[in-house]
Amino acid sequence: IIGFGISGRHSITVTTLTSAGNIGEDGILSCTFEPDIKLSDIVIQWLKEGVTGLVHEFKKGKDDLSDQDEMFRGRTAVFADQVIVGNASLRLKNVQLTDAGTYKCYIITSKGKGNAKLEYKTGAFSIPEVNVDSNASSESLRCEAPRWFPQPTVVWASQVDQGANFSEVSNTSFELNPENVTMKVVSVLYNVTINTTYSCMIENDIAKATGDIRVTDSEIKRQSHLQLLNSKAS
């Protein structure tokens, strides 16, 4: 989201990036602005809709947490050495589901004021591991990912049979983790063929992850990747 300031002084451009946070890790809320040559003239305020106090404030070259809301105490930081070049991004420690929402990055410099909103989604996502299922009676593949939230969809695909629907020959289960939020995802694909690459694709509205496996007579080749969705500029 690109925002422009109003009021007496000139407006400055502030740009945020809609992003996702993985609960139980540190997250980044991205915000950049037209830089100022003097650090002491820059004020950064992070606000969250529905929260009374500030998320974070940085001014005169230092953090000012005197008006910080209780829910963010001990959890936020800006990259102080990068503020001078226009980076107002916020680091958020130990992301929780409740951190989701609409944030505003508000900037004041000697050139003017500006702000932009950011939609922060929170959930859980992890890279799946695909293995040959030794427990199964027939040749099967087992795709396992330890942490997802909200509940994702799981789709199997084959390089050979690209249009195939494997829902009839696969079984997917979701097991709630001990913290009662995230879930372990397990999907088994039956009757697989040797020398074929199979992909286990796990996706929710926050992330998409893929685990590939190719079993031959001599070796097992694996590959995996994770992609965050909806990272669009604002």
């Epitope: 139980g24 963010f72 105490r73 001990g74 959890r75 936020t76 420690k93 859980a124």
Partner: antibody, heavy 115, light 109 residues
Framework: EVQLVESGGGLIQPGGSLRLSCAAS????????MNWVRQAPGKGLEWVSV???????YYADSVKGRVTISRDNSKNTLYLQMNSLRAEDTAVYYC?????????WGQGTTVTVSS | EIVLTQSPGTLSLSPGERATLSCRAS???????LAWYQQKPGQAPRLLIY???SRATGIPDRFSGSGSGTDFTLTISRLEPEDFAVYYC??????????FGQGTKLEIK
């Protein structure tokens, strides 16, 4: 009551291995950043390792490649597997929960590395 | 690597006096990620201050924290006999992930 209880310390020869445990009660280990911090006799506090709620792990340079932090979610317990132990690993080892800071600490377990 | 240097190494004061302990970082540290701990002999550390200035649960109001950037201070306004201990500052968020200062010993004069 929120509590951490360490165990598994003892006297071990240089080059040996040991697994420390930290049993948590009153909160869920897998929802928090869980740390191991050690203190050599008469010295200050030294951070050893952390495991995030997500399972991501980090280590101090002094122990990297020799220790592994892990947890058993079903037992609500944190572990520190220590290999290739050296005399300089002799210390009291504490586990600590980090929410906004390290607000809950165990009583510590003593590891002595000596021949 | 961020190095936290505490001063003085030892502070000798009497009960009722004011104690000022300093923690200086080798580079800027986020105020949110700066904490202070108290440790008594044979005991585990206890969190006193987090976010540079917020008192932890159950900590008396004679303990206060201040500072930002590279300079942080722990102040004990009026020393009680039970306050004589070792105090550590600690930061989070940079490689290594956590760093402690070397400690300040507060002893009875």
């Amino acid at each position: 009551e929120v509590q951490l209880v360490e165990s598994g310390g003892g006297l071990i020869q240089p080059g040996g291995s040991l697994r420390l445990s930290c049993a948590a009660s009153g909160f869920t280990v897998s929802s928090n950043y869980m740390n191991w911090v050690r203190q050599a006799p008469g010295k200050g506090l030294e951070w050893v390792s952390v495991i995030y709620g997500s399972g991501r792990t980090y280590y101090a340079d002094s122990v990297k490649g020799r220790v592994t932090i892990s947890r058993d979610n079903s037992k609500n317990t944190l572990y520190l597997q220590m290999n290739s132990l050296r005399a300089e690993d002799t210390a009291v080892y504490y586990c600590a929960r980090d929410t906004y800071a390290m607000d809950v600490w165990g009583q510590g377990t003593t590891v002595t590395v000596s021949s | 690597e961020i190095v936290l240097t505490q001063s003085p190494g030892t502070l000798s004061l009497s009960p009722g006096e004011r104690a000022t302990l300093s923690c200086r970082a080798s580079q800027s540290v986020s105020s949110s990620y700066l904490a202070w701990y108290q440790q008594k002999p044979g005991q585990a550390p206890r969190l006193l201050i987090y976010g540079a200035s917020s008192r932890a649960t159950g900590i008396p109001d004679r303990f206060s924290g201040s500072g930002s950037g590279t300079d942080f201070t722990l102040t004990i306004s009026r020393l009680e006999p039970e306050d004589f201990a070792v105090y550590y500052c600690q930061q989070y968020g940079s490689s290594p992930m956590y760093t402690f200062g070397q400690g300040t010993k507060l002893e009875i004069k």
